[in-house]
Amino acid sequence: TTELTEEKYEYKEGQTLEVKCDYALEKYANSRKAWQKMEGKMPKILAKTERPSENSHPVQVGRITLEDYPDHGLLQVRMTNLQVEDSGLYQCVIYQHPKESHVLFNPICLVVTKGSSGTPGSSENSTQNVYRTPSTTAKALGPRYTSPRTVTQAPPESTVVVSTPGSEINLTNVTDIIRVPVFN
């Protein structure tokens, strides 16, 4: 039996949640991925990737951005401008047929509180530096940035194939499979 352990993230309003969801690339590289919030027994899909997944092709739904890296078996999730009401339990989802449930672990428990986050609009202390010289730059030597694709928010959907961040459970060695009911 593998325990589903939550990872708790605490943020102030206005900050950005930034997490990764690992998946078995040989199984799920070409699958659609989604980000869902657990609202009672009904998981609510907030955003999902397109099919087939493409590297460096972000999908944006409101404040949520998903970037799938099928070459690396990684889904990057960002939720910007966090609000208190965003608090809750989140999971990454492999968006497949409901009966093909593969359970991974490490759901995200997000706690957003009011207060100064040092985000835009906050006042900063004046600096007391004596000297400062011109700026230098370092570059990330990665793929060129592509503007995120904006997607219209679809109605909430439900799914059962849960793939949450962390390492994949090898189903041949798992005795307890968690099955999430489907609601139509």
């Epitope: 950005t16 930034e18 990764k20 690992d22 690339l25 970037e67 078996g73 490490n106 793929p143 390492s167």
Partner: antibody, heavy 121, light 106 residues
Framework: QVQLVQSGAEVKKPGASVKVSCKAS????????IHWVRQAPGQGLEWMGW????????NYAQKFQGWVTMTRDTSISTAYMELSRLTSDDTAVYYC??????????????WGQGTLVTVSS | SYELTQPPSVSVSPGQTASITCSGD??????VCWYQLKPGQSPILVIY???KRPSGIPERFSGSKSGNTAILTISGTQAMDEADYYC????????FGGGTKLTVLG
């Protein structure tokens, strides 16, 4: 407690390869990415890539693609970084580092002690 | 490619406040962390998630953000704080800023 212990200093000739090891202890090795970062003399920190110990998959910075290889041996909780076709520009201290959490790529909360690689003819 | 820009050097008198900036495109939507690096030592994480301090890091270290600029502030700077400081973010790949050498005068 979490520890990352790296192999000792190396002196290599130009054109040769070097393989640096990073032995992890104090946590479940498979659960966290291992990153490799280097610092050349007088230069800043440079991220080389990450290794997912669970799958063995790696993601390399574009600069290093084709001449760096990151692998692991889960039986001894050790990650490896091999750099080929060395030049004098590769003289640097090489660090391994571990993610703070299973569900993030940054920050790097734990670091190895560093391995000095000197490339000289 | 993604870039993070830092001033190469900042100087401050003991007991004063030092501020080191790090700017980059869309940095306001990225989680920023900061590392301290002293000669002959491994980097130390001093700030993560924009403004959180790992255990063991003194309270005089704080982080904040204004727009697409992250700021590491060291209040009541001490001689032992003299070091190189690097910001870091994740945008497809991991990127470090160019580093800022903090000099404590006197």
């Amino acid at each position: 407690q979490v520890q990352l212990v790296q192999s000792g200093a190396e002196v290599k000739k130009p054109g040769a390869s070097v393989k640096v090891s990073c032995k992890a202890s104090g946590y479940t090795f498979n659960g966290y990415y291992i990153h490799w970062v280097r610092q050349a003399p007088g230069q800043g920190l440079e991220w080389m890539g990450w290794l997912n110990p669970n799958s063995g998959g790696a993601n390399y910075a574009q600069k290093f693609q084709g001449w760096v290889t990151m692998t692991r041996d889960t039986s001894i909780s050790t990650a490896y970084m091999e750099l080929s076709r060395l030049t004098s520009d590769d003289t640097a201290v090489y660090y391994c580092a571990r993610d703070q959490r299973k569900t993030t790529v940054t920050p790097f909360e734990y670091w190895g002690q560093g391995t000095l690689v000197t490339v000289s003819s | 490619s993604y870039e993070l820009t830092q001033p190469p050097s900042v100087s401050v008198s003991p007991g004063q406040t030092a501020s080191i900036t790090c700017s980059g495109d869309k940095l306001g939507e990225r989680n920023v962390c900061w590392y301290q690096l002293k000669p002959g030592q491994s980097p130390i994480l001093v700030i993560y998630q924009d403004n959180k301090r790992p255990s063991g890091i003194p309270e005089r270290f704080s982080g904040s953000k204004s727009g697409n600029t992250a700021i590491l502030t060291i209040s009541g700077t001490q001689a032992m704080d003299e070091a190189d400081y690097y910001c870091q973010a994740w945008d497809r790949n991991v990127v470090f800023g160019g580093g800022t050498k903090l000099t404590v005068l006197g």
